[in-house]
């Protein structure tokens, strides 16, 4: 809007309001065991792992924050089983962290999100 | 679990990563209109703002991570009717950002976020 | 208030590339996305992509993929749109048109008008 | 892609009478997350196209309330309660819920 009708800092504090909500990689807390898709006897110590995920507005209503490209991060956890057989183990899980995110039409086909190895 | 079975610098990462996950607040970016219940023949610029919200995770799978107080920002931006009748209107919004969170049993009954003066 | 101002004609040769521009006045250029569409001579409208000025993210018409590409220069306010590999049916008015929070195309330019003749 | 089907194709309306124009798309516009993303745009002649309504029922600013849009899911109608003289023009309708983005192949409207 013409800058003639509005204070020039003003407009700068609202346009850099609206830059900071824009579609990036935020850090977030994810719960691991629904993420990986475990039966409710499985569940992890600590239960959420913080990574980066895409999130934000777009310019536009129908767009969606999307991630364009992820890399794994590995995560130590405690995997406990219920009942209690044996001593939690340490295991190493790989959990999607978001590098890149782009505002998108459609969701994609296939979002992976984490991977046990 | 006990440090006998674990090396102490990998159970004091988990920790690590177990504190920061925990339920607190975090910033995170609103869309105003669909807070504010807004119809369609208005809107917003920017539409989304930043503030926190509780976020993150509980011990318990029935506990939910809820705001207990609660300080109002005002934010400047503008309100615009369609059709426009008028030059953009500069307004000040305020918007809810919680400043205390607990993990609660159950969501409380009366929700607030925005409030227009 | 909102203002698109695109360049003036141009007649291209077969195979030759265009590049049209679009200057906007009167808004925060990166708080909306940039839609490029067509209109050949008599015909009907074609979308092409759009860009999003904030990051330079682009979506294209798959029809267009690999000819087409958008771009933008936030300190001038400008938008581009570049064409490839011109054919004949590639003569059309080329727009470019601002795009609502809501979806809809709500300020246009006057429009480039590309002939491609040899 | 969306097709975006216009009836009619040309409609020759009397001056201060009500004119209608249908538009179907070939799958629902219903956005996932609930708005559906149907707008009209008009083009006077050697004019670029304006925007009329969007989000199917929202008239655009400066758009006289004779112009109204409704429908849902895959079928939409603009009304025109009282046709004037600068209503002249070709009338589309075009889809922002899918990639491509897509247009009706257009609607003549003619005074008598």
């Known amino acids: 809007f013409a800058a003639t009708f509005y204070d020039i800092e003003t407009l700068k504090v609202i346009d850099e309001e609206w830059q900071r909500t824009q579609c990036s990689p935020r850090e977030t807390c994810v719960e691991v065991a629904s993420e990986l898709g475990k039966s409710t006897n499985t569940f992890f110590k600590p239960p959420c792992v913080n990574v980066f995920r895409c999130g934000g507005c777009c310019n536009e209503e129908s767009l969606i924050c999307m991630n364009t490209s992820t890399s794994y991060i590995s995560k130590q956890l405690f995997e406990i089983s219920v009942p209690l057989t044996s001593v939690p183990e340490l295991v190493p899980v790989k959990v999607a962290n978001h590098t890149g995110c782009k505002c998108l039409p459609t969701a994609p086909r296939h979002p992976y999100s984490i991977i046990r190895r | 679990f006990a440090a006998t079975f674990y090396d102490i610098e990998t159970l004091k990462v988990i920790d690590e990563e177990w504190q920061r996950t925990q339920c607190s607040p975090r910033e995170t970016c609103v869309e105003v209109a669909s807070e504010l219940g807004k119809s369609t023949n208005t809107f917003f610029k920017p539409p989304c703002v930043n503030v926190f919200r509780c976020g993150g995770c509980c011990n318990e799978e029935s506990l939910i991570c809820m705001n207990t107080s609660t300080s109002y920002i005002s934010k400047q931006l503008f309100e615009i009717s369609v059709p426009l009748t008028s030059v953009p209107e500069l307004v000040p919004v305020k918007v809810a950002n919680h400043t205390g969170c607990k993990c609660l049993p159950t969501a409380p009954r009366h929700p607030y976020s925005i409030i227009r003066r | 208030q909102v203002q698109l101002v695109q360049s003036g004609a141009k007649v291209k040769q077969p195979g030759a590339s265009v590049k049209a521009s679009c200057k906007a006045s009167?808004?925060?250029?990166?708080?909306?996305?940039m839609y490029w569409v067509r209109q050949a001579p008599g015909q009907g409208l074609e979308w092409m992509g759009y860009?999003?000025?904030?990051?330079?993210?682009?979506t294209y018409n798959q029809k267009f993929k690999g000819r087409v590409t958008m771009t933008t220069d936030t300190n001038t306010s400008t938008a581009y749109m570049e064409l490839r590999s011109l054919r004949s049916d590639d003569t059309a008015v080329y727009y470019c048109?601002?795009?609502?929070?809501?979806?809809?195309?709500?300020?246009w330019g006057r429009g480039t008008l590309v002939t491609v003749a040899s | 892609d969306i097709v975006m089907t216009q009836t009619p194709l040309s409609s020759p309306v009397t001056l201060g009478q009500p004119a209608s124009i249908s538009c179907r798309s070939s799958?629902?516009?219903?956005?996932?997350?609930?708005?559906?993303?149907l707008h009209w745009l008009q083009q006077r002649p050697g004019q670029p196209p304006r925007l009329l309504i969007y989000?199917?029922?929202n008239r655009f600013s400066g758009v006289p309330d004779r112009f109204s849009g409704s429908g849902a899911g895959t079928d939409f109608t603009l009304k025109i309660s009282r046709v004037e003289a600068e209503d002249v023009g070709v009338y589309y309708c075009?889809?922002?819920?899918?990639?491509?983005?897509?247009f009706g192949q257009g609607t003549k409207l003619e005074i008598k």
């Open positions: 048109a601002r795009t609502s929070y809501y979806g809809g195309m709500d300020y």
């Open positions: 009167g808004y925060t250029f990166t708080g909306y996305n």
């Open positions: 860009i999003d000025p904030y990051n330079g993210d682009t």
């Open positions: 799958q629902s516009l219903v956005h996932s997350n609930g708005n559906t993303y």
């Open positions: 989000k199917v029922s």
């Open positions: 075009s889809q922002s819920t899918h990639v491509p983005r897509t």
